[in-house]
């Protein structure tokens, strides 16, 4: 572990209440193929424990979805991954809208610091699928 | 190679017959920019040779496609990546539907074991593009 | 640095003139969360400085976009990432069309050589968002 190979792959646990756009994650072999090796979960949000550049990736699939259901809403359903705490480092890292699709998937390299907590905010009225092959979120330390 | 840097990037060889949803892959410098360094192909399916956590990624583009062609089919075209053998470890790892799009692309971290064979199942009547910049599938060992 | 951990994450600087489909990138801590550690920029294009297999990833979001704006154009908006110089190694590595979506995101493993310059060509009349969480491009050296 001293090599700094911090890595995590999470599955969706639940969504928050109406006024909380955050997705709440869970991980661990007992749950399936999710795991945390280095990073940790704090009330369903992923906290980084080692400074470095990370590859952050996410896929979210909407649960009851057709191309019409995503397009007919006035406010498009949007997924944003960002640092939500500490407040001094708050920033949006990655953002996608669903438009006429039912799945978004992306990845990016970004510097993260020990103590950064990542939030994944799903705005809109549509709910995500909890199937572990459709919705997942992960980080991988790639270099100092 | 002893570092365990197993890695592969594959290009589409062909689709299976009508009752076989699997995509059949090929790899090697003579074919273009595809390669296998560690993993191997077994009848067009990717077999893992080293235990570890892998980043699995895929992009599939449909060959003759418009947003209407993907939306007008009763059974949506879906791509699923999973472990198909050994049977005891069979599981879907990653799944996406095309809805009104013509390309899906995603990636995820997942533990894989020596002998796991990965299958990529494309269900529906639409066929994938065989262009090497539009359809590809790869894995990268990232840690034990 | 001798480990060969070359890595870069870039943000969009600007688009080229009408007859130049290339996107022009920029990177560096002063600009936000983008950085270059090994690769370098040559007139806004990313140049590789170390041979190896790289994970190349990109996300591009169109700036003023709805599903109708991407679908109603005769020539669909397409993003292609390729080696544009040296000419002898020119090849398209990764290609996606927007169809009825407003964001494309993908990634792939590919061998790159010192001196390879990567170009990202956006064809069509729609312009990309310069928001750093919506449009970004990066490479990561993963093995020799």
């Amino acid at each position: 572990e001293s090599l700094g190979w911090d890595i995590a792959e999470l599955q969706l646990n639940h969504t928050g209440p109406q006024q909380d756009p955050r997705l709440y994650w869970q991980g661990g072999p007992a749950l399936g193929r999710s795991f945390l090796r280095g990073p940790e979960l704090d009330k369903g949000q992923l906290r980084i424990r080692r400074d470095g550049i990370y590859m952050v990736h996410i896929q979210v699939t909407l649960a009851i979805c057709s191309s019409t259901s995503t397009s007919r809403h006035h406010h498009p359903t949007t997924l944003a991954v960002g640092i939500c705490s500490p407040a001094s480092r708050s920033i949006s890292l990655l953002r996608l809208s669903f438009h006429q699709g039912c799945t978004i998937a992306s990845q990016r390299l970004t510097p993260l610091a020990r103590g950064d907590t990542l939030c994944t905010n799903l705005t809109g009225t549509l709910l995500p699928s909890r199937n572990t092959d459709e919705t997942f979120f992960g980080v991988q330390w790639v270099r100092p | 190679e002893s570092l365990g840097w197993d890695i592969a990037e594959l290009q589409l060889n062909h689709t299976g017959p009508q009752q076989d949803p699997r995509l059949y892959w090929q790899g090697g410098p003579a074919l273009g920019r595809s390669f296998l360094r560690g993993p191997e192909l077994d009848k067009g399916q990717l077999r893992i040779r080293r235990d570890g956590i892998y980043m699995v990624h895929i992009q599939v583009t449909l060959a003759i496609c418009s947003s209407t062609s993907t939306s007008r089919h009763h059974h949506p075209t879906t791509l699923a990546v999973g472990i198909c053998s050994p049977a005891s470890r069979s599981i879907s790892l990653l799944r996406l539907s095309f809805h009104q799009g013509c390309t899906i692309a995603s990636q995820r971290l997942t533990p894989l074991a020596r002998g796991d064979t990965l299958c990529t199942n494309l269900t529906g009547t639409l066929l994938p593009s065989r262009n090497t910049d539009e359809t590809f599938f790869g894995v990268q060992w990232v840690r034990p | 640095e001798s480990l060969g951990w070359d890595i870069a994450e870039l943000q969009l600087n600007h688009t080229g003139p009408q007859q130049d489909p290339r996107l022009y990138w920029q990177g560096g801590p002063a600009l936000g969360r983008s950085f270059l550690r090994g690769p370098e920029l040559d007139k806004g294009q990313l140049r590789i400085r170390r041979d190896g297999i790289y994970m190349v990833h990109i996300q591009v979001t169109l700036a003023i976009c709805s599903s109708t704006s991407t679908s109603r154009h005769h020539h669909p908006t397409t993003l292609a990432v390729g080696i544009c110089s040296p000419a002898s190694r020119s090849i398209s590595l990764l290609r996606l069309s927007f169809h009825q979506g407003c964001t494309i995101a993908s990634q792939r493993l590919t061998p790159l050589a010192r001196g390879d310059t990567l170009c990202t060509n956006l064809t069509g009349t729609l312009l990309p968002s310069r928001n750093t969480d919506e449009t970004f491009f990066g490479v990561q050296w993963v093995r020799p």
């Epitope: - | 062909h14 299976g16 017959p17 009508q18 009752q19 060959a63 003759i64 066929l127 593009s129 065989r130 | -």
Partner: antibody, heavy 119, light 107 residues
Framework: EIQLVQSGPELKKPGETVKISCKAS????????MNWVKQTPGKGLKWMGW????????TYADDFKGRFAFSLETSASTAYLQINNLKNEDMATYFC????????????WGQGTTLTVSS | DIQMTQTTSSLSASLGDRVTISCRAS??????LNWYQQKPDGTVKLLIY???RLHSGVPSRFSGSGSGTDYSLTISNLEQEDIATYFC?????????FGAGTKLELK
Amino acid sequence: EIQLVQSGPELKKPGETVKISCKASGYTFTNYGMNWVKQTPGKGLKWMGWINTDTGEPTYADDFKGRFAFSLETSASTAYLQINNLKNEDMATYFCAREEDYRYVFNYWGQGTTLTVSS
Amino acid sequence: DIQMTQTTSSLSASLGDRVTISCRASQDISNYLNWYQQKPDGTVKLLIYYTSRLHSGVPSRFSGSGSGTDYSLTISNLEQEDIATYFCQQGVTLPLTFGAGTKLELK
């Protein structure tokens, strides 16, 4: 050796029903779908559709929805094409065809069954 | 539906000739183009699939090429047993469609 052997020529009157058989041998019948192709002198080859030999689910091309039916007798490794309420335009040669490794690429064909419709 | 057009319905050639048969699709079919041979007795055989891949057992004098909408089948050195009708077929989307055929005859 893989073979598809079709039933013999048929002479029918308009309004009657015909059932053409295609017996497969040399492979596991339920592993590969069976396709049907119509050949007329004036209009060449026309794909009629196919039947999933594992599930029995048929898929018909638009021009062959209604009077046409694909069916199976799995125990006999045989696929059938039935045409109801025969019309003069049904007069043609009908082929069954099977893929090997590639989707929609037919490398095994029956010898064809000629259907004559005449009053 | 994708229309497949074989503009030449019949073609006369001599033994030993190089013969090219063309086929045009009404839209880009992404190289999912197959060629079949039908002998005068009605027997149908696959010759070439995916534009240029030779089916096993097919003589190497047969070759295929093309891209986008335009494709061709070439017989480099015509032999007596090649006298037949040749059909192209798009295999990219349903319904599958065939060309009207090109009948090859001896001069």
